[in-house]
């Protein structure tokens, strides 16, 4: 960057390089160049010349000031004029940043996906610092009182081989960067409390035509968890409202499940399932898409869906599993 | 020519709180970060925490939380740290130290205050 | 927290010896924000190098300073009686900003 550059001088920030964004600050230059005493110091801020709020502090040295600076980066350089030099001559120059110290973490939440191998460890980190800014996750055992620390710039995935200190842990978060520190306050967590079940996938989907026509959705999980809670929720995609549908499932086979809804509309169904009784959710599954036939039965499966239609065929379509904004994965 | 200077040795009790007081002189003192370390009779210098006296604006090392409080009278220029809760752990010299943007670093140190904690 | 290693803790050298101390952070730290400070008993640190390889106002042209990322070092080209004190390097890249231990330097 411009740090690199060969200096015949000397640029500098009051207060200083890394800064709280919005401040007044000072950038200084002091020209040390043999045979020249400058006529004039000139400041650039990305290459461009700055023209207002610059003083002439003394001979070698001057000032740009500027008010409620809030550019998170920017490449400050001066130049002087010497007598008898065509061209300016480059002093110094210094990369700059401004930001914010980190917010207190909050919501701290360690979850064990199952089969990963790995505590995932995630958290709010509150308002963007726009500064370089690290976290440690402290992991402590309530058993055997050892901490292990991981150094993170986001989330964190720690494996479960590592956490050998038994099954309770406090878990907390320190957020750092040049403008300051904070940390959260502690999760108590039981590694058997935190697992959520592999994931819950929608394969297909079948509408019988009967008397009231029923759509069968079908769907599995690959879990060998045995107690475990499940919500579909479907609506039609014109809708705002989710309905949703509770079970207790054991995945030992492919469920299926009944609903009655409306001829020639398309819906869209989603899936998510916990361990019985305990805290957090899988996320909903991906958005599966399913059009009710107008009279003629239809099959929609995960592979084939088109809003193709063929004179009393079955036809199959491909679900995209694209994410709309109701579809956050939340584990709270 | 910049100076800080700082209040004098303290022998308190523990339990009891203590302020001390650093005086600065030679420059803008509302234009510079002002920090704090300690440093303990054999042992390394930690970092306390700065205040910004301009707008009052603290940063605390965490370990520090709740033992330190930094604060300023831009009337006199002054800084000044309480240490609350005291125990002998705390005692050691206490130094003020001004963060210059030249150097962008520590670039003048008050003399220190020492303190001693017993009963 | 950054933990800065300073090494040798303790390290006597001659009059006119080559002397290198090192530093070394826990995790990366820009050359920017590694100082080095010195402190001889009974006095304040005194600022000595600042961002690694700039000499402060007044310390001596055989003192130099090297180095990045998590490795760093404090090089003195002639050991001189005055130069026998405790050095201390120092991040100032992420709070809490930390000091390694120091390296006292005595005359041999």
């Known amino acids: 960057g411009i740090t690199n550059i060969n200096c015949s001088g000397h640029i500098w920030v009051e207060p200083a390089t890394i800064f709280k964004m919005g401040m007044n600050i000072s950038i200084y230059c002091q020209a040390a160049i043999k045979n020249c005493q400058p006529r004039k110091l000139h400041f650039y801020k990305n290459g461009i010349k700055e023209r207002f709020q610059i003083t002439r502090i003394n001979k070698t040295t001057a000032r740009l000031w500027y008010k409620n600076f809030l550019e998170p980066h920017a490449s400050m350089y001066c130049t002087a004029e010497c007598p008898k030099h065509f061209q300016e001559t480059l002093i110094c120059g210094k990369d700059i940043s401004s930001g914010y110290p980190p917010d207190i973490p909050d919501e701290v939440t360690c979850v064990i996906y199952e089969y990963s191998g790995n505590m995932t460890c995630t958290w709010n980190a509150g308002k963007l610092t726009y500064i370089d800014t690290k976290y440690v996750v402290h992991v402590k055992s309530l058993e055997t009182e050892e901490e292990q620390q991981y150094l993170t710039s986001s989330y964190i995935n720690i494996s479960t081989d590592s956490l050998q200190g038994g099954k309770k842990y406090l878990v907390w978060v320190q957020a750092a960067n040049a403008l300051g520190m904070e940390e959260s306050k502690q999760l108590q967590i039981h590694l058997d409390d935190i697992v959520i079940p592999s994931a819950a996938v929608i394969s297909r989907a079948e509408t019988i035509n009967a008397t009231v026509p029923k759509t069968i959705i079908y769907w599995d999980s690959q879990t060998t968890i045995e107690k475990v809670s499940c919500e579909m929720r479907y609506k039609a995609t014109t809708n705002q409202t989710w309905n949703v549908k509770e079970f207790d499932t054991n995945f030992t086979y492919v469920q299926q499940s009944e609903f009655y809804l409306e001829p020639n509309i398309k819906y869209v169904f989603q899936v998510r399932c916990q361990e019985t009784g305990k805290r957090y959710w899988q996320p909903w599954s991906s958005l599966f898409f399913h059009k009710t036939p107008e009279t003629v039965p239809q099959v929609t499966s995960k592979a084939f869906q088109h809003d193709t239609w063929n004179s009393g065929l079955t036809v199959a379509s491909i679900s995209t599993g694209h994410l709309t904004s109701d579809n956050r994965g939340d584990i709270g | 020519e910049f100076q800080l200077q700082q209040s004098g040795p303290e022998l308190v009790k523990p339990g009891a709180s203590v302020k001390m007081s650093c005086k600065a002189s030679?420059?803008?003192?509302?234009?510079?970060?002002m920090h704090w370390v300690k440093q303990s009779h054999g042992k390394t210098i930690e970092w306390i925490g700065y205040?910004?006296?301009?707008?009052?604006?603290?940063s605390y090392n965490q370990k520090f939380k709740g033992k330190a409080t930094l604060t300023v009278d831009k009337s006199s220029s002054t800084a000044y740290m309480e240490l609350r809760s005291l125990t002998s752990e705390d005692s050691a010299v206490y130094n003020c130290?001004?963060?210059?943007?030249?150097?962008?670093?520590?670039?003048?140190w008050g003399q220190g205050t020492s303190v001693t904690v017993s009963s | 927290d950054i933990v800065m290693t300073q090494s040798p803790a303790i390290m006597s050298a001659s009059l006119g010896e080559r002397v290198t101390m090192t530093c070394t952070a826990s995790s990366s730290v820009s050359s920017s924000y590694l100082h080095w400070y010195q402190q001889k008993p009974g006095s304040s640190p005194k600022l000595w190098i600042y961002?690694?390889?700039n000499l402060a106002s007044g310390v001596p042209a055989r003192f130099s300073g090297s180095g990045s990322g998590t490795s760093y070092s404090l090089t003195i080209s002639s050991m001189e009686a005055e130069d026998a004190a405790t050095y201390y390097c120092?991040?100032?890249?992420?709070?809490?900003?930390?000091f390694g231990s120091g390296t006292k330097l005595e005359i041999k």
């Open positions: 961002s690694t390889s």
């Open positions: 205040i910004y006296p301009n707008s009052g604006d603290t």
């Open positions: 030679g420059y803008t003192f509302t234009n510079y970060y």
């Open positions: 130290a001004r963060f210059g943007g030249f150097y962008d670093a520590m670039d003048y």
């Open positions: 120092h991040q100032y890249h992420r709070s809490p900003f930390t």
